[in-house]
Interface confidence: medium
C-alpha cells in the first residue's frame, strides 16, 4: 500500500479508565494530512462516532474507558499529499488496583509513572493527563499509599503536586485522580506514580534543553557525508549524559562493525548560568536504509530526533 512503517510506542495502561493517544509525528503531521486509526491491521478504521467506547477524535484514539481486551497493536495512518506513514502503537492493558500492590513490579514503565523528588529541596510531581479537547478534566486529587495527601508541605497546582522540603519519607506509591467528562458522561482517571528520592545536589529536577535538532527531517542525497550537531543547554552542575541513539541503541554500538555512522567527541561552552554542549553524529556515507529512521539525540531525560529524507527531484534540469 506504499505506507512507510514506523514502530513508535509501547504503552502500559490500566484497565477500566479512560485513555487517549495522539497520533503525532512532527515531521509528518505538521502539514496538511489526514489521520486514520486502525486496530491490529484491520481494514476497517476505528469509529469516529463519539458515542462509541473506542473512537477517533481528530488525531486521537480515545478509549472511554479502556478494557482488558483492548490490548494490541494500533496503527494510525498519516496520509499527506505525497506521502503515507503508518505508526504502530503497542498498547498493553493490565488490571491494576492501585491500593493492593506496588506498581514497582510492572515492566518498562514510562517516566510518567516513575518520578524523582530531590531531598531537602522544593520539588514537584506531575500528573500526566493527555486527552483531546473534547475531554474536560476536573480538579486533581493526590494520594500516597491510598490516603489523600494533606498538609502544609503539599500544594496542588494545576497538574502538579508541589512538595516543599522533600524528605526521605516522601518516597513511595502515589496516585493522582481526576474526573474526566466527555459527552455528558463522567469517568475516573487514576494514574499511579512510583516516587524515589535522590540526594543529588544541584538544581531541583533540572531538565536539559535540546536546542537542535527539533524533531525534523533533513534532505540529504544518497551517498553523501553528513554531520549533524546536537546542541544541548544544561545547568553547570549537571550529571546528564548526552549521546546519539538509533533504534534505542548507541550509534557507536549499532554501527560497531561498519563504523559508517559514528558519534563525535562532545565539546561545551560555558555561560553565566549554564553550559552549551555539542555532540555530533557523522554519516560517512548516507545509505538507503538510513532514510525514514529517527536518529535520536538524548540528553538526560530529553530527546530530539532527525529523520533523513531524499531530496525531492528537481525537474528544472530537464
Amino acid at each position: 500500500d506504499g505506507c512507510k512503517d514506523i514502530f513508535m510506542k509501547n504503552e502500559i495502561l490500566s484497565a477500566s479508565q479512560p485513555f487517549a493517544f495522539n497520533c503525532t509525528f512532527p515531521p509528518i503531521t505538521s502539514g496538511e494530512v489526514s489521520v486514520t486509526w486502525y486496530k491490529n491491521s484491520s481494514k476497517i478504521p476505528v469509529s469516529k462516532i463519539i458515542q462509541s467506547r473506542i473512537h477517533q477524535d481528530e488525531t486521537w484514539i480515545l478509549f472511554l474507558p479502556m478494557e482488558w481486551g483492548d490490548s494490541g497493536v494500533y496503527q494510525c495512518v498519516i496520509k499527506g499529499r505525497d506521502s503515507c506513514h503508518r505508526i504502530h502503537v503497542n498498547l498493553t492493558v493490565f488490571e491494576k488496583h492501585w491500593c493492593d500492590t506496588s506498581i514497582g513490579g510492572l515492566p518498562n514503565l514510562s517516566d510518567e509513572y516513575k518520578q524523582i523528588l530531590h531531598l531537602g529541596k522544593d520539588d514537584s510531581l506531575t500528573c500526566h493527563l493527555h486527552f483531546p479537547k473534547s475531554c474536560v478534566l476536573g480538579p486533581i486529587k493526590w494520594y500516597k499509599d491510598c490516603n489523600e495527601i494533606k498538609g502544609e508541605r503539599f500544594t496542588v497546582l494545576e497538574t502538579r503536586l508541589l512538595v516543599s522540603n522533600v524528605s526521605a519519607e516522601d518516597r513511595g506509591n502515589y496516585a493522582c485522580q481526576a474526573i474526566l467528562t466527555h459527552s455528558g458522561k463522567q469517568y475516573e482517571v487514576l494514574n499511579g506514580i512510583t516516587v524515589s528520592i535522590t540526594e543529588r545536589a544541584g538544581y531541583g529536577g533540572s531538565v536539559p534543553k535540546i536546542i537542535y535538532p527539533k524533531n525534523h527531517s533533513i534532505e540529504v542525497q544518497l551517498g553523501t557525508t553528513l554531520i549533524v550537531d546536537c546542541n544541548v543547554t544544561d545547568t553547570k552542575d549537571n550529571t546528564n549524559l548526552r549521546c546519539w541513539r538509533v533504534n534505542n541503541t548507541l550509534v557507536d554500538d549499532y554501527y560497531d562493525e561498519s563504523k559508517r555512522i559514528r558519534e563525535g567527541v562532545e565539546t561545551h561552552v560555558s555561560f553565566r548560568e549554564h553550559n552549551l554542549y555539542t555532540v555530533n553524529i557523522t554519516f560517512l556515507e548516507v545509505k538507503m536504509e538510513d532514510y525514514g529512521l529517527p536518529f535520536m539525540c538524548h540528553a538526560g531525560v530529553s530527546t530530539a530526533y532527525i529523520i533523513l529524507q531524499l531530496p525531492a527531484p528537481d525537474f528544472r534540469a530537464y
Partner: antibody
Framework: EVQLVESGGGLVKPGGSLRLSCAAS????????MNWVRQAPGKGLEWVAL??????????YYSAPVKGRFTISRDDSKSTLYLQMNSLKTEDTAVYYC??????????????????WGQGTLVTVSS | DIVMTQSPSSVSASVGDRVTITCRAS??????LSWYQQKPGKAPKLFIY???NLHTGVPSRFSGSGSGTDFTLTISSLQPEDFATYYC?????????FGQGTKLEIK
C-alpha cells in the same frame, strides 16, 4: 500584571545605613532571580547585585564597588527583595531599581535579560 | 570585567529616519546582550534580549543583531515616541555590565 515597588530610599549621611525593600506581585517570585540596578543622577545604569532563586541555592553576586558593604536578600514567603546598604558613600547616591531577571532555572535556563523594572527609589548620601 | 562600549553616545535624527546604535563587548559574549529604552524620569524597559529577540509589546520597527563582540540596535523608521536613551547590557558573565548609553534626540 508584573509589579515591582521599591521603598526605603531617603537621605542618609556618609557612613550611615539604609535598607531598601521591593514588593513583588503578579508573578511567581520564588522562581526568579532578582537584581538591584542603580543610576546616579544624570549618569548611566550600573548593576549592583543579584540573588538567584531557591532552586539555584540563593547564590549571590555583587559588583565590585558595593561588595562587602551591601547585602542582597529575599523573603520568598513575602515576595520581597531587600538591599541592606551599610557604610554608605556619597558615590552611592542614585535611584535604585529592583529588577526581575528572565533567568528562572525551572528545568532549564531562560534567556538572560532584565525584563521588569520597578519605578525606583532615590537614595541620597550627603552630609 | 567585560566592558561594553556604545556608539555613538548621542545621535540626532528625524521622524521616519533609520537609526543604528552599536554596542561592542571587550570579549566574546555570544548572544547574551539585551537592549533597554529609558525615558527621562522613568525606569528602563527591556526592548530586545538575546541579541535579536523582541520583548513583548515592542514595535517591529526595532530589531537587534550581532553575536560575539559586535551588536547593533536598529530602528527602521523613527517615531516620535522613540526619542529616548538606549542602553545595552551583557549578561554573559558576572558582573553584569551596561554600555554607557546612547541618547537619541530630535533633529
Amino acid at each position: 500584571e508584573v509589579q515591582l515597588v521599591e521603598s526605603g530610599g531617603g537621605l542618609v549621611k556618609p557612613g550611615g545605613s539604609l535598607r531598601l525593600s521591593c514588593a513583588a506581585s503578579g508573578f511567581a517570585f520564588t522562581d526568579y532571580y532578582m537584581n538591584w540596578v542603580r543610576q546616579a543622577p544624570g549618569k548611566g545604569l550600573e548593576w549592583v547585585a543579584l540573588i538567584r532563586n531557591k532552586a539555584a541555592g540563593y547564590t549571590i553576586y555583587y559588583s565590585a564597588p558595593v561588595k562587602g558593604r551591601f547585602t542582597i536578600s529575599r523573603d520568598d514567603s513575602k515576595s520581597t527583595l531587600y538591599l541592606q546598604m551599610n557604610s554608605l558613600k556619597t558615590e552611592d547616591t542614585a535611584v535604585y531599581y529592583c529588577v526581575r531577571d528572565m533567568t528562572i532555572y525551572d528545568g532549564y535556563y531562560v534567556d538572560y535579560a532584565l525584563d521588569y523594572w520597578g519605578q525606583g527609589t532615590l537614595v541620597t548620601v550627603s552630609s | 570585567d567585560i566592558v561594553m562600549t556604545q556608539s555613538p553616545s548621542s545621535v540626532s535624527a528625524s521622524v521616519g529616519d533609520r537609526v543604528t546604535i552599536t554596542c561592542r563587548a571587550s570579549q566574546n559574549i555570544n548572544i547574551w546582550l539585551s537592549w533597554y529604552q529609558q525615558k527621562p524620569g522613568k525606569a528602563p524597559k527591556l526592548f530586545i534580549y538575546k541579541a535579536s529577540n523582541l520583548h513583548t509589546g515592542v514595535p517591529s520597527r526595532f530589531s537587534g543583531s550581532g553575536s560575539g563582540t559586535d551588536f547593533t540596535l536598529t530602528i527602521s523608521s523613527l517615531q516620535p515616541e522613540d526619542f529616548a536613551t538606549y542602553y545595552c547590557l551583557q549578561s554573559q558573565s558576572y558582573p553584569l555590565t551596561f554600555g554607557q548609553g546612547t541618547k537619541l534626540e530630535i533633529k
